[in-house]
Structure formats: C-alpha cells, structure tokens
C-alpha cells in the first residue's frame, strides 16, 4: 500500500513510529536520479552543500549516496493492533557526516552535518513503487514526500485521494 496519509487520524502515526534498532539492517551505496533520469548532485559551496537536479553530460560521473535502511514499527492508529506492521525507513548521506534533512517549515530538503543519533528529520519512510522506483516520505510529516520542484529537491504534500501526476516524487536508485 502506498499508504499516503492525507487523513487526519493518520498524522500521528509516523511521529509515534519508533526505529526498532539504532543500527541499520543494511546499507546501500547508490546514485539517485529522478523518474525522468535527471541526476541528483551535491556541490560544496561556501562551506555548505547544495543539492541540484540536473542532466549530466555523457561521461560525467554520478554522485553517490549512502542509504541506510532501518526497520520501523508503524503503529496503527486505526486498528490499535499493529496490523500495519513494520515499514522500512531510510537515511541518505552523500558524504561523511552529512545527511539529507526535511525542513518542513521551509518545505525544503537540506544537507545538514550532524552526529548520531540522527534527528527524526533525517529519516524517511521508504515506499517501494513500480517501474523500479522508490519514494521518500518524511517521518516527521506524514503525506509529505521528497520531490522535484524547479530543478531542486523540495518537500511536496501528497494526498492519496487526489488524482495527481506523481512522477515528481519517484526516484531511481542505481549502483552505476
């Protein structure tokens, strides 16, 4: 179930979800690209990192991101019996000590330097989508996803009951 909230009684579910272990179940080094095959790149500018969405030249090397996968319980506010089961959460780190963060106030995605344990803003619910794609939902803001807006990553509110084009929140992971 793509389980996107957009429903009031769901809004606490991810806030209350707990990472079952402090160490990831597995890690994966991959390049991140959009549904339309634009690359997600990271550039150090004035001692801070900027995130870009761009077309790479033919032989240009793609930036890699370390994805750390965590198991997380998804408590069901609807049933009270935990029937929603466990879900997978992920953190994304393009370089040592830096992680993607959700800035819900600014609706932006930022790279922050921080130490473990990571804040909730660095965790995203991983959605397994068709067409070999995934989506990243904010742990701190259910129904809000990492998406592409004006050649940048942004936070995009999604409602499962709306008939919207969703390609801007779909991402591909590749080892190459």
């Amino acid at each position: 179930a793509f389980g996107i909230s957009g429903v009031q009684k769901y809004t606490r579910a991810l806030h209350d979800s707990s990472i079952t272990g402090i160490s990831p179940i597995t890690e994966y080094l991959a390049s991140l690209s959009t549904y339309n095959d634009q690359s997600i790149t990271f550039a150090l500018e004035d001692e801070s990192y900027e995130i870009y969405v761009e077309d790479l030249k033919k032989d240009e090397k793609k930036d890699k991101v370390l994805l750390s996968y965590y198991e997380s319980q998804h408590p069901s506010n609807e049933s009270g019996d935990g029937v929603d089961g466990k879900m997978l959460m992920v953190t994304l780190s393009p370089t040592k000590d830096f992680w993607l963060h959700a800035n819900n106030k600014e609706h932006s995605v930022e790279l922050h330097k921080c130490e473990k344990p990571l804040p909730d803003q660095a965790f995203f619910v991983l959605h397994n989508m068709h067409s070999n794609c995934v989506s990243f939902e904010c742990k701190t803001d259910p129904g809000v996803f990492i998406g592409v807006k004006d050649n940048h990553l942004a936070l995009i509110k999604v409602d499962s009951s709306e008939n919207l084009c969703t390609e801007n929140i779909l991402f591909k992971l590749s080892e190459t």
């Epitope: 179930a1 793509f2 389980g3 996107i4 909230s5 957009g6 429903v7 009684k9 769901y10 179940i25 597995t26 890690e27 994966y28 080094l29 991959a30 994805l67 996968y69 998804h74 069901s76 609807e78 049933s79 029937v83 929603d84 089961g85 466990k86 879900m87 997978l88 619910v125 991983l126 959605h127 397994n128 989508m129 068709h130 070999n132 995934v134 999604v158 409602d159 499962s160 009951s161 709306e162 008939n163 919207l164 969703t166 992971l173």
Partner: antibody, heavy 121, light 111 residues
Framework: EVQLVESGGGLVQPGGSLRLSCAAS????????MNWVRQAPGKGLEWMAE??????????HYAESVKGRFTISRDDSKNTVYLQMNSLRAEDTAVYYC????????????WGQGTLVTVSS | DIVMTQSPDSLAVSLGERATINCRAS??????????LNWYQQKPGQPPKLLIF???SQGSGVPDRFSGSGSGTDFTLTISSLQAEDVAVYYC?????????FGQGTKVEIK
C-alpha cells in the same frame, strides 16, 4: 478491527463470468494497494492481480494466466475492491483471497478468509 | 517470470528441534540493496500470515524462533525450536518483479 471480507464466489460453468467483491473495514481503504491471490484445492498460492491508488491513476497489474480475462477494480467510496472474472476455465477453480499490501508496499499483511470459485459443467 | 523453488517439499521435525526450509529464485531478487523475498505461514483452513520480509526482517508479532537469511537467489527460513503450533505450510515469495511469484510450499510436520 481491520478486516477484508470476500463474497461472490460459487459454481459457474466453463466460459461463464463471476464478479468477486471484497469489503474492507477498520482502515483507510483509499490509502492501500490491494491484491487478489488464489489457491487451487490442495495447491499453493498464486498471485493474480494488483490495483494501486487514485493517486497512482489506479494502475493495475496481472498474472499472465488471467491477463485479458480478469479485471481488478476498486470503489474507494464503498471501501471495496472487485475481481471481474470472464471466460472462466476449470483451472480457475480455487479459493480467492483479497489481500492488502502494507504501508510502503513491501509485503501483504492483511488477508481475507477467501471465497471459493468452482468452474465446472 | 521469476520461478521460486522450495526444498524440501515436506519436513518432519521433532518438537524443540530446528527446521530449515530453502528457497531458490531463478534469478536474483535483489534490488535497491535489499532482497525482495518474503516468507508466509499458512495453517489449514486459514489465509497466509507474513513471517519475514526483505529476506531477514521479522513481521510484527512473529516469534523470535522464526528467522530468515540469504540474498540474491538463495534464501533460508529457520525455525530454531519447533513448536506444535508451527505445523503449517510455508511459502517463499518474491516481490521484486511482477508477477509476484510464490514457491510451491513446504509442509512442516511433527516427527
């Protein structure tokens, strides 16, 4: 309580049609991908069909054995998913389970009790 | 289609002993750095129940005696100490590609 209840099964002649229904309760139905899985008598499990969300344009996927004969659909206002089965064959005889995928689409974690479809003359 | 093959077809194990079921995929079920391999338990007259997802993660409320391992094409479900209530048929399933396919099942009985 989270529940899926199938109905519409029964005896049908080869070449006939049947529509199965699955009524969902206890969760926000419109948020979940739904599946049909069948099990022939004394046999193993066979995945049949899947439908996504309005948000995903209700995209559908089918097993090759039923493609073109079976159609999965849903009515979010009625919390119901359907399986329209046409041109039925003896080999379609099975218990048909309605099933819900979990939050994030990693596995099926809610199943109905199943409804028996018998195709025989 | 990815073909899933389980072995053995049936298994008789004494109470308290270890039971091991194998599952082999006709091609790798790995994607995104994970194995898209689930294990289900089905008791007579009941629908299946999830035990393990992404090869080694336990489903909610699943007893610790059930564990999964493997990657690529070869996977194992282990019941560390068989209990009477574990008598059932066990299925592996790949969810990497459509059509999602199940193994033929392994029947576990008490010796």
């Amino acid at each position: 309580e989270v529940q899926l209840v199938e109905s519409g099964g029964g005896l049908v002649q080869p070449g006939g049609s049947l529509r199965l229904s699955c009524a969902a309760s206890g969760f926000t139905f419109s948020n979940y991908w739904m599946n049909w899985v069948r099990q022939a008598p004394g046999k193993g499990l066979e995945w049949m069909a899947e439908i996504t969300l309005k948000f995903n344009s209700y995209s559908t996927h089918y097993a090759e054995s039923v493609k073109g004969r079976f159609t999965i659909s849903r009515d979010d206002s009625k919390n119901t998913v359907y399986l329209q089965m046409n041109s039925l064959r003896a080999e379609d005889t099975a218990v048909y389970y309605c099933a819900r995928r979990n939050y994030g689409n990693w596995y099926i974690n809610v199943w109905g009790q199943g409804t028996l479809v018998t195709v025989s003359s | 289609d990815i073909v899933m093959t389980q072995s053995p077809d049936s298994l008789a194990v004494s109470l308290g002993e270890r039971a091991t079921i194998n599952c082999r995929a006709s091609e790798s079920v790995d994607k995104f750095g994970m194995s898209f391999l689930n294990w289900y338990q089905q008791k007579p007259g009941q629908p299946p129940k999830l035990l393990i997802f992404v090869a080694s993660s336990q489903g909610s409320g699943v007893p610790d005696r059930f564990s999964g391992s493997g990657s690529g094409t070869d996977f194992t479900l282990t019941i560390s100490s068989l209990q009477a209530e574990d008598v059932a048929v066990y299925y592996c399933q790949q969810s990497k590609d459509i059509p999602y396919t199940f193994g033929q099942g392994t029947k576990v009985e008490i010796k």
